[in-house]
């Protein structure tokens, strides 16, 4: 059946922690992605940004999780209003920012 929201959020946090802790070389060879507004619809916005990164084994599981948690189909080059279209950041920074925000949501009990 569907993954409970709290479980989904916790699993995603654990995976992002794993990425940040195990990072040796520049994550995804220093690939840049669009920054996003960390608000409602964040899972889809994060996927829309990260789906444009390919060949990066370190974030494959994160992409899978975000794809499962986003209710609609997302393809490369797709953008929502949640993107800060004039700001690109490294994947490593994107992951750190997302992780901090998800931890905050988890502490506050905001699972959806």
């Amino acid at each position: 059946g569907p993954v409970p929201p709290s479980t989904a959020l916790r699993e995603l946090i654990e995976e992002l922690v794993n990425i940040t802790q195990n990072q040796k070389a520049p994550l995804c060879n220093g690939s840049m992605v669009w920054s996003i507004n960390l608000t409602a619809g964040m899972y889809c916005a994060a996927l829309e940004s990260l789906i444009n990164v390919s060949g990066c084994s370190a974030i494959e599981k994160t992409q899978r999780m975000l794809s499962g948690f986003c209710p609609h189909k997302v393809s490369a080059g797709q953008f929502s209003s949640l993107h800060v279209r004039d700001t690109k950041i490294e994947v490593a920074q994107f992951v750190k920012d997302l992780l901090l925000h998800l931890k905050k949501l988890f502490r506050e009990g905001q699972f959806n």
Partner: antibody, heavy 118, light 111 residues
């Protein structure tokens, strides 16, 4: 335009080694995953292994001990090396590039035929 | 390793009729709501061509007569109506777990 082209020795003696090069154009190997797949004459497809853009390498369990995959991103080349060749390694060898997530094999080379025979 | 078993090994379908190919996985290929099963078409003397990804998504440029369905361990590729140019061998492939694996293939003949 995305292109992949395999080049190999054609004929290899049993017990010998095989080296195949996949030369690509139209994209960078630093952000693309390349798979190696083979197909014996008249038979099905067998996944051999892959190298990710970030350098991680995965191998098929059955061939792990005989297989080595590497790349030179600056030359846009991926390499497959196989040791201790047997006659049942005779096949067409393909390199294939994954598309973006969910990483299905979207772009394929034409393949290179390898015969293991004395 | 996840074993993919295709059936039938071969089939002959009349022009304009429906062709149905099955792929059964030895364990689930689902992960976080998606099925990591893909379908390829291979014509004689050519490399494979991606048709369907994530079980049911049509690859760009592939005719709408091709469709995919299924989840967990049971998947189906349907061609309806079959055209003469669809004569080929079809393979399922999973990448839910390493190593990636292919099914044994199904050869489609057009009557």
């Amino acid at each position: 335009e995305v292109q992949l082209k395999e080049s190999g020795p054609g004929l290899v003696a049993p017990g010998g080694s095989l080296s195949i090069t996949c030369t690509v154009s139209g994209f960078s190997l630093t952000d693309s995953s390349i798979n190696w797949v083979r197909q014996p004459p008249g038979k099905g497809l067998e996944w051999l292994g892959m190298i990710w853009g970030d350098g991680r390498i995965d191998y098929a369990d059955a061939l792990k001990s005989r297989l080595s995959i590497s790349k030179d991103s600056s030359k846009s080349q991926v390499f497959l090396e196989m040791t201790s060749l047997r006659t049942d390694d005779t096949a067409t060898y393909y390199c294939a590039r994954d598309g973006r997530f969910p990483y299905a094999m979207k772009f394929w080379g034409q393949g290179t035929s390898v015969t293991v025979s004395s | 390793d996840i074993v993919l078993t295709q059936s039938p090994a071969s089939l002959a379908v009349s022009l304009g009729q429906r062709a149905t190919i099955s792929c059964r996985a030895s364990e689930s290929v689902d992960s976080y709501g998606n099925s990591y099963m893909h379908w390829y078409q291979q014509k004689a003397g050519q490399p494979p061509k991606l048709l369907i990804y994530l079980a049911s998504n049509l690859e760009s440029g592939v005719p709408a007569r091709f469709s995919g369905s299924g989840s967990r361990t049971d998947f189906t590729l349907t061609i309806d109506p079959v055209q003469a140019e669809d004569a080929a061998t079809y393979y399922c492939q999973q990448n839910n777990e390493d190593p990636r694996t292919f099914g044994g293939g199904t050869k489609l003949e057009i009557k």
